[in-house]
Interface confidence: medium
C-alpha cells in the first residue's frame, strides 16, 4: 500500500477491492451485522467501522483481501482525524454562525430527511 | 412550535431565524466557540450542538430567539434519533456491503477530502 496515496485515491481503490472480494466476504450466510436504516452515512461511521471489524474477524485473510481491510483501516484513520478537527479551533461567534448556517443549509438541501 | 412540523420545514425556518437574530447572537465579542475546520458537517454534530449550548447560555432569551434555540434542540433530537438508527437493525453481510459501498461512494463523490 503506497503510504502517501491521497485519501480520494484510497477510497476509489477500496471500492474496487470491495467489488473484487464481494463473493468471499458474503460467504458467511449466518453472520448478521448492524446496518444503518438511513442514508446519512457520516452519522454512522462508528457503527460502519465496528461492522467492518466484525466482518474482518470472519474473513479468510491473505493477498488483496488483507489490503482491502488495511485500506479500510486507513480510511478510518482519516475519518478519526477529521473528527478530531471538529473541536480543535476556537473562533468568534460570527464564524461559528457561518458554520452552523452552512450545516443547516447542507441539511436542507442534501440530507435525506424522513419526518 | 407545531409538534408535527416536518424536519425539513423546521430546518428552513431555523435558517431564517438564524439570519434574523444574527446581530443579537454576535453581540458577545469575547466569546470563542470551537468551529470545525472542514466541511464534513455530519462528522461534527456533537461539537456543533455543544457550541449551540454555549451560545444559548450567553444569549438574552425571549421572543423569537427563544424559538430559534427550541428549533435547534428539535433538530438535535432528530439527529440523535438518526444516530440511534445507525445500529438498530442487524442484517446479512450482503446488505452491510451494500451500505459500505454506498458510504464509500458518497465519500468518493461528495466529501471534501484534503489529503
Amino acid at each position: 500500500i503506497p503510504t502517501e496515496i491521497p485519501t480520494s485515491a484510497l477510497v476509489k481503490e477500496t471500492l474496487a477491492l470491495l467489488s473484487t472480494h464481494r463473493t468471499l466476504l458474503i460467504a458467511n450466510e449466518t453472520l448478521r451485522i448492524p446496518v444503518p436504516v438511513h442514508k446519512n452515512h457520516q452519522l454512522c461511521t462508528e457503527e460502519i467501522f465496528q461492522g467492518i471489524g466484525t466482518l474482518e474477524s470472519q474473513t479468510v485473510q491473505g493477498g488483496t483481501v488483507e489490503r482491502l481491510f488495511k485500506n479500510l483501516s486507513l480510511i478510518k484513520k482519516y475519518i478519526d482525524g477529521q473528527k478530531k478537527k471538529c473541536g480543535e479551533e476556537r473562533r468568534r461567534v460570527n464564524q461559528f454562525l457561518d458554520y452552523l448556517q452552512e450545516f443547516l443549509g447542507v441539511m436542507n438541501t442534501e440530507w435525506i430527511i424522513e419526518s | 412550535i407545531p409538534t408535527e412540523i416536518p424536519t425539513s420545514a423546521l430546518v428552513k425556518e431555523t435558517l431564517a431565524l438564524l439570519s434574523t437574530h444574527r446581530t443579537l447572537l454576535i453581540a458577545n465579542e469575547t466569546l470563542r466557540i470551537p468551529v470545525p475546520v472542514h466541511k464534513n458537517h455530519q462528522l461534527c454534530t456533537e461539537e456543533i450542538f455543544q457550541g449551540i449550548g454555549t451560545l444559548e447560555s450567553q444569549t438574552v432569551q425571549g421572543g423569537t430567539v427563544e424559538r430559534l434555540f427550541k428549533n435547534l434542540s428539535l433538530i438535535k433530537k432528530y439527529i440523535d434519533g438518526q444516530k440511534k438508527k445507525c445500529g438498530e437493525e442487524r442484517r446479512r453481510v450482503n446488505q452491510f456491503l451494500d451500505y459500505l459501498q454506498e458510504f464509500l461512494g458518497v465519500m468518493n463523490t461528495e466529501w471534501i477530502i484534503e489529503s
Epitope: 503510504t3 474477524s57 479468510v60 479500510l72 | -
Partner: antibody
C-alpha cells in the same frame, strides 16, 4: 483477565516437527486474530504469521511459508503453530500474541513463550 | 519488506534522565508503529501503539511520536524498573517487522 498460556519447552532433533499450543482465556477466542512471533537466543523479534480463529484463514511470513502451519481448536479456545523440518537455527522462544484490534496490527497480550531447542 | 532501523542498539542512562530511542522505517508507514518493552525471560509488553497512543495501564512517563518514516520513543524520567530492551514494530503491512532492539542500562 485475558491470558494466553503456551505449552512447555521442547527439545527436537533436526528434521523433526514441533507443535506449540496457545490456550486463550478471559475473552472470546474467535474475536481476535492470533499472531506468532519468535525470538532466537540473544536476538530480536521475528514475525512468523497470523491465524484467524474465526475463519480459519492465515497469512504466513514468506520465510516460513513452506514449513509452518497454524490451526485452532475453537472448542478449547486453543491456537496451534506447527513448524516442520526443524534446523538448528529454529532454536528460539516462540510466542503467540493477540492482535489489539482490526485496525491496529499490534499485540496487547502475549503468551509466556515456549522454548524450542533443536539439537542433534 | 519494510525495514525498521532502531538506534541506538544500547544505551546507558541515570535514574531521572530523559531517554530517547528512534526508529526509521524504510518506507512511509503513516503512524502504524508500536513500542514494546521486554525484560529478560519475559514476553514483550505493549507500551505505545499508533505511534503515540499509550496502552492502558502504562505510566505516562512513556511517550511516542512521529509519522511517515521517523519515529521516536521517550522515557521522560528514567526509573530503575525501566531497565529492559525496547523494540519498535511496524503494523503497516505484512510481513510485520520489528526494530533490532535497544538495550537500556542504568549508569
Amino acid at each position: 483477565e485475558v491470558q494466553l498460556v503456551q505449552s512447555g519447552a521442547e527439545v527436537k532433533k533436526p528434521g523433526a516437527s514441533v507443535k506449540v499450543s496457545c490456550k486463550a482465556s478471559g475473552y472470546t477466542f474467535t474475536d481476535y486474530i492470533i499472531h506468532w512471533v519468535r525470538q532466537a537466543p540473544g536476538q530480536g523479534l521475528e514475525w512468523m504469521g497470523y491465524f484467524n480463529p474465526n475463519s480459519g484463514g492465515s497469512n504466513y511470513n514468506e520465510n516460513f511459508k513452506r514449513r509452518v502451519t497454524m490451526t485452532r481448536d475453537t472448542s478449547i479456545s486453543t491456537a496451534y503453530m506447527e513448524l516442520s523440518r526443524l534446523r538448528s537455527e529454529d532454536t528460539a522462544v516462540y510466542y503467540c500474541a493477540r492482535r489489539i484490534a482490526w485496525d491496529h496490527w499490534y499485540f496487547d497480550f502475549w503468551g509466556q513463550g515456549t522454548m524450542v531447542t533443536v539439537s542433534s | 519488506d519494510i525495514q525498521m532501523t532502531q538506534s541506538p542498539s544500547s544505551l546507558s542512562a541515570s535514574v531521572g534522565d530523559r531517554v530517547t530511542i528512534t526508529c526509521l522505517a524504510s518506507e512511509g508507514i503513516s503512524n502504524d508503529v508500536a513500542w514494546y518493552q521486554q525484560k529478560p525471560g519475559k514476553a514483550p509488553k505493549l507500551l505505545i501503539y499508533a505511534a503515540s497512543r499509550l496502552q492502558d495501564g502504562v505510566p505516562s512517563r512513556f511517550s511516542g511520536s512521529g509519522s511517515g518514516t521517523d519515529f521516536t520513543f521517550t522515557i521522560s524520567s528514567l526509573q530503575p524498573e525501566d531497565i529492559a530492551t525496547y523494540y519498535c514494530q511496524q503494523g503497516y503491512k505484512t510481513p510485520l517487522t520489528f526494530g533490532q532492539g535497544t538495550k537500556l542500562e542504568i549508569k
